[in-house]
């Protein structure tokens, strides 16, 4: 299929050759001539510099499973639709789609071949890691919770007696031994009571009483001795 | 296993416009090309369009002056709106995902069946 | 479009004998994209064969597709109860996607 082009132009003058830069369409290959280049076409195109082409669906130039669409027809161009994983006219370039960079936010792309599949990091999910599940907006912390943000991470402050990722669970006041000096802790309706050993008191049992009687409190309330249950609101 | 499910309107007057919507249960809706088929009743199977992610469309050409394919990553879902329906429009609407290796059809959602009448 | 025209309509068979089924189309079906699929009463069709001969996933190897360019056959070596459904072939080599109009194995 090879096209002698003329030359039209002082193509042949002392500038650069006439195969410089490739004026050959779809793959064709440059040849110099004595008057000018020509190009050999690959099949299917054809013209002076191969920019026709003669293809149609029937030929079947869509590879690695591409469906050919449209090119009914000599005179009429095809496309073809390539599936994941490939690209170029005729679906024949396979597709690195990690170097896209799909994945959002720091999420980590693999390539599976005829799938691609984003991992992402924690606080993150999605198809392509696009939902930030770490941000408060919308977000709701049970039970009177209140969201906090920080460092690209949420979590929920719970109200009292109440803890978990979202202040759903119910906590054991007690758990975290709040009662000082010995004082055994008794979880309650609202919260927490310490009854506290011989010799302290206060509402953790963290105020020695002193031997003459007094406490280290400014004053004690009314009604309270010491070793009485403490209740902590 | 990815799974597919069809909802929409079972009953459909003439002249209105088909909306039917294709859930998909995991989050491969960008890994793959999506598709509509349908079946007349005790008919053979014929395909009505397919979409990609990339927003890649193709339409049957009998069709294609009344159909809209759409797709919305954010929800897993993929969906078909046939307008200015008739009774030759009656059928169990399927959706499917394109296979990997070529425009055939690997998974299939179980189909939801369409009447056309006033 | 490439029309696909799927004989016979209807083959009566036993279980355990062999099924031949054709497909054949009006042109060229380029690069052998050629599927078949099974469809039971009331469900959705499954894809059996790719690419003309390739299994799909998980079916068995008692059935086998053969052919290119314009004339196909899937077999079933040896039928069993559960083989008794229509099949469709389905061409993806140009667009618009076609179907056979099906073939339906019945137990005789």
């Known amino acids: 299929y090879p096209y002698d082009v003329p030359d039209y132009a002082g193509m042949l003058g002392s500038g650069p050759g006439p195969c410089d830069g490739n004026p050959c369409a779809n793959g064709g290959s440059c040849s110099e001539t004595p008057r000018s280049f020509e190009c050999t076409c690959p099949r299917g195109f054809y013209g002076l510099r191969c920019e026709v082409s003669g293809v149609t669906c029937a030929d079947g130039p869509c590879f690695n499973g591409g469906l050919c669409v449209g090119g009914a027809d000599p005179d009429s161009a095809y496309i073809c639709h390539c599936p994941p994983g490939f690209q170029g006219s005729n679906c024949e370039k396979r597709v690195d789609r990690c170097s896209l960079q799909p994945c959002r936010n720091g999420g980590l792309c693999l390539d599976l071949g005829h799938a691609l599949r984003c991992r992402c990091r924690a606080g993150f999910a999605g198809p392509r890691c696009e939902h930030d599940l770490d941000d408060c907006a919308g977000r709701a912390c049970a039970n009177g919770g209140t969201c906090v943000e920080g460092g690209g991470a949420h979590r929920c402050s719970c109200a009292l007696g109440f803890g978990g990722r979202d202040c759903r669970e119910r906590a054991d006041p007690c758990a975290a031994r709040p009662c000082a000096h010995g004082g055994r802790c008794y979880a309650h309706f609202s919260g927490l009571v310490c009854a506290c050993a011989p010799g302290y008191m206060g509402a953790r049992c963290e105020f020695p009483v002193h031997p003459d009687g007094a406490s280290a409190l400014p004053a004690a309330p009314p009604g309270l001795r010491p070793g009485d249950p403490q209740r902590y609101l | 296993q990815v799974q597919l499910q069809e909802s929409g309107p079972g009953l459909v007057k003439p002249s209105e416009t088909l909306s039917l919507t294709c859930t998909v249960s995991?989050?491969?809706?960008?890994?793959?090309?999506w598709s509509w088929i349908r079946q007349p009743p005790g008919k053979g199977l014929e395909w009505i369009a397919y979409?990609?992610?990339?927003?890649?469309?193709n339409y049957n050409p009998s069709l294609k002056s009344r159909v809209t394919i759409s797709l919305d990553t954010s929800k897993n879902q993929f969906s078909l709106q046939l307008s200015s329906v008739t009774a030759a429009d009656a059928a169990v609407y399927y959706c499917?995902?394109?296979?990997?290796?070529?425009?055939?059809?690997?998974?299939w959602g179980q189909g939801t069946m369409v009447t056309v009448s006033s | 479009e490439i029309v696909l025209t799927q004989s016979p309509g209807t083959l009566s068979l036993s279980p355990g004998e062999r099924a031949t089924l054709s497909c054949r189309a009006s042109?060229?079906?380029?690069?052998?994209?050629l599927a078949w699929y099974q469809q039971n009463p009331g469900q959705a069709p499954r894809l059996l064969i790719y690419g003309a001969s390739s299994r799909a996933t998980g079916i068995p190897d008692r059935f086998s597709g053969s052919g290119s360019g314009t004339d196909f056959t899937l077999t079933i070596s040896r039928l069993e109860p559960e083989d008794f459904a229509v099949y469709y072939c389905q061409q993806y080599g140009t667009s618009p996607l076609t179907f056979g109009g099906g073939t339906k194995v019945e137990i005789k």
């Open positions: 995991d989050n491969s809706i960008s890994n793959y090309y």
């Open positions: 499917a995902r394109v296979f990997h290796w070529g425009f055939a059809f690997d998974i």
């Open positions: 042109q060229r079906v380029s690069n052998t994209y």
């Open positions: 979409i990609y992610y990339s927003g890649t469309t």
